[in-house]
Structures are given as C-alpha cells and as structure tokens.
C-alpha cells in the first residue's frame, strides 16, 4: 500500500497566507507499484480550469502549486495517493489573508523576569499574535571566548527551541528543569513573519537555597 515518505513534516494542516503569494501543497509518498496522486478541493476533483491563473501539478514532486492566491482559493485541499493495494489521503486547509499583515505582536509583560532556586523547575510564557505564520524562537544570550558579542557587534545567542506556529494566536512556553547557575542570564522570545520581527528580552536569576 502507499505510504508517506515524510510524515513528520506533514503535521502542518493549516496554511495562512497573505493574498498574492504562492502556495505549494506537497504529499511526498511511495509504494510498490508507484502510486498515483490526485487532488480535491472541498471534496471535489480539482483541475486547473477551476481557478483563474490555473494550477501546476508536479506528479513527480507530489505537489500542487497555486501562484498569486486570492480569497476564492480558501478551502480544504486533499491529496489522494493510491495504487492497487490501497489509498492514503491528507487534507490541508488554506486561508488567504486579505488584510495586509503586520509583524508579530508580543503580549505586554510576557515573558516576565524570574528568580529561581537551584535545582527547581522554571517555566516562561510568551504570547504571540500574528496573522501571517510566525517563526517562533526561544533564545539565550551566551558568551564565546569570554565575549558576549561577535566581531560585527551581533550578540551571541543559542537557539533553545524553534518552530513555525500554525495559529494566529500562540501561547508558547519554555520549560527549564533542574536549573543550575549556568541557566541564569538573559533570554529572548522572538517571533518573525515575512513582515518583520518582534522580540522580548527577559532574565532568569538562579540562587542557592536560603
């Protein structure tokens, strides 16, 4: 029977895309015999003549491309992959954003500075609002060879967590377990979309038990 070759990358079911941009849906698959792929929009066969500007189907790439998307492109897009031994399907939802998007907004006051006891667990919250898919990162300022900044003046940071959020409103958390003095320092919650960047710095202080 057919199977997905990149199932771990197919968990993003919603694409929120500003109008005029290009969208590509992909369902990379394999099987023996080599399966075929077809596409549905809102449960019905989807062909190029169904949209102004047409579509690009790349069977070898398991992909459907729509250039210059408009609000009428909103809907559920399903790939159906089948051979004589069975079929599998995946549905993506496309939302086309008509309003011009803004850079991400971080809720004021979050994340808050915290003081923690050695060996305790700490959790930071960051609330991100973005009408275009944001790339969210938790970062920590670090020193390299005793310096906090590189030769070009850019601060040295290490990426603790990084992912692309699917929701317009994301309540994200950074959990640090069994903190040591090394965990103390300055951190960042950073959210980026194609318009710009928003970030908030915060501090963790770690001290011994009183």
């Amino acid at each position: 029977a057919p199977y997905w070759t990149r199932p771990e990358r197919m968990d993003k079911k919603l694409l929120a895309v500003p109008a005029a941009n290009t969208v590509r849906f992909r369902c990379p698959a394999a099987g023996n015999p080599t399966p075929s792929i077809s596409w549905l929009k809102n449960g019905r066969e989807f062909r190029g003549e169904h949209r102004i500007g047409g579509i690009k189907l790349r069977h070898q790439q398991w992909s459907l491309v729509m250039e210059s998307v408009v609000p009428s492109d909103r809907g559920n897009y399903t790939c159906v992959v089948e051979n004589k031994f069975g079929s599998i399907r995946q549905t993506y939802t496309l939302d086309v954003l008509e309003r011009a998007p803004h850079r991400p907004i971080l809720q004021a006051g979050l994340p808050a500075n915290q003081t923690a006891v050695l060996g305790s667990d700490v959790e930071f919250h960051c609330k991100v609002y973005s009408d275009a898919q944001p790339h969210i990162q938790w970062l920590k300022h670090v020193e390299v060879n005793g310096s906090k900044v590189g030769p070009d003046g850019t601060p040295y940071v290490t990426v603790l967590k990084s992912w692309i959020s699917e929701s317009v409103e994301a309540d994200v958390r950074l959990r640090l377990a069994n903190v040591s003095e090394r965990d103390g320092g300055e951190y960042l919650c950073r959210a980026t979309n194609f318009i710009g960047v928003a970030e908030k710095a915060f501090w963790l202080s770690v001290h011994g038990p009183r």
Epitope: R9, A20, F194
Partner: antibody, heavy 126, light 109 residues
Framework: EVQLVQSGAEVKKPGASVKVSCKAS????????ISWVRQAPGQGLEWMGW????????NYAQKFQGRVTVTTDTSTSTAYMELRSLRSEDTAVYYC???????????????????WGQGTTVTVSS | QSVLTQPPSLSVAPGKTATFTCGGN??????VHWYRQKPGQAPVLVMY???ERPSGIPERMSGSNFGNTATLTITRVEAEDEADYYC???????????FGGGTKLTVLG
C-alpha cells in the same frame, strides 16, 4: 505589465550619501516587500536589506546596518535606498526587487525576488 | 547564517546538459531559488521552491534539492543560456536573504 523602474546613474565622492529610487507599477505595491541587492564590478549578488511596503518595517544585512536606510512612499508606489558614508568599495550596480512569499506545506515559508529593476550604477570616486 | 557554495565556472557544449550545484549545510531542509543574469542585465528568477519554473521559463530547466546540495539542470544547452546563475535561500533564523557566489556558464563553440 509588472515592472520596477530605478533612478539614473550617480557619481559620488567618498564620504557622501546616495539615494536611489525604485518606482513600481502594474501591481498592488503594498502586497509585496522590496529588497535591495547590489553587485560590484565582476562580483556576485549581495543582499543589502528589505522593507515592508505595508508598514515600513525594515531588515538589513549586518554589513550595512547603520549605513543604509530603506524607505517607501505608498502614495507614489516608490521605494528608496539611501547609503551613507560612501567608500570606493561601494561602487556597484544597485538593484531593487519585488519580494514574493512562497508558502510550502512541508518546508514552511520562503521568500524570493520575482521582479527586478534595471539597476542603478553608483560610482564612488575622488 | 547560511553559507551557499557554487563553483565559479562551468563550460558545456551546445546540445549537452549543464548541471549547476549549490552546496550548503542541510540545504535540502530549505527551499532554494535560482536566478539567471546575462551580461549587463538584471537577474531573472528561473526556478523557485527548488523545482518550480516561473511562467516563460523553458521546460529544459529543472531543479532538485537533497541533503547538502541543490541542483539546477539545463538540458539541450543553447548559446542563449550563457549567463551567471545564482542560488538563493531565505535564512528564517535571521530573516535574511543569502545568495551563492554564482556560476558562470560558458557555452562552447
């Protein structure tokens, strides 16, 4: 027809500033960002920065941070790039380009430049 | 920040196949765009999202991207393909555009 038309060639002295314009036509200006890319004689393409035509947000390559300013005037669908404290190494052709977003269900979002201006030659010489 | 490596030059006889490479650490996890620049002209987008051709770009051009190498292939090379070819990625960590150094294609004869 979608096009970007840039201002004419400039000759500047070291230490001076230059401001290059890029007028867009044939599409909705605020739906796409504008990038600036330069090319020194015989060299490759070097990205300088980009601007959101919607809200004016900017993002610059570290190399040009503090020396370049990119702005837009939505009333005339024009983007501008100003480079200050010019040196001889800034002699190059400067291009503006429309930034298009590509959203992929597996790889996320990526940006490229689908329409380019004709280029503006800036010569820095004493 | 991503670093993209391209061989500086490539020579191909007419009618043969030109293969441009763009090397980068785990570049297969990113999407790559390709531009062609003819002498004295502005760059032109010839491939986006690794494999997609903009309208007006001939089917002789194709792309792929796996592991540490992205590839642009031109079959049945013609004299008019002579140009510089640049790969480009979007570095989502810094929100910066990154170009490869470019490859100059010379069509022999």
């Amino acid at each position: 027809e979608v096009q970007l038309v840039q201002s004419g060639a400039e000759v500047k002295k070291p230490g001076a500033s230059v401001k290059v314009s890029c007028k867009a036509s044939g599409y909705m200006f605020t739906s796409y960002g504008i990038s600036w890319v330069r090319q020194a004689p015989g060299q490759g393409l070097e990205w300088m920065g980009w601007v959101s035509t919607y809200n004016g947000d900017t993002n610059y390559a570290q190399k040009f941070q503090g020396r370049v300013t990119v702005t837009t005037d939505t009333s005339t669908s024009t983007a501008y790039m100003e480079l200050r404290s010019l040196r001889s190494e800034d002699t190059a052709v400067y291009y503006c380009a429309r930034v298009l977003g590509y959203y992929d269900s597996i790889d996320g979002y990526y940006y490229g430049m689908d329409v380019w201006g004709q280029g503006t030659t800036v010569t820095v010489s004493s | 920040q991503s670093v993209l490596t391209q061989p500086p030059s490539l020579s191909v006889a007419p009618g043969k196949t030109a293969t441009f490479t763009c090397g980068g650490n785990n570049i297969g996890d990113k999407s790559v765009h390709w531009y062609r620049q003819k002498p004295g002209q502005a760059p032109v987008l010839v491939m986006y999202l690794d494999t997609e051709r903009p309208s007006g770009i001939p089917e002789r051009m194709s792309g792929s991207n796996f592991g540490n190498t992205a590839t642009l292939t031109i079959t049945r090379v013609e004299a008019e393909d002579e140009a510089d070819y640049y790969c480009q990625v979007w570095d989502s960590g810094s929100d910066h555009v990154v170009f490869g150094g470019g490859t100059k294609l010379t069509v022999l004869g």
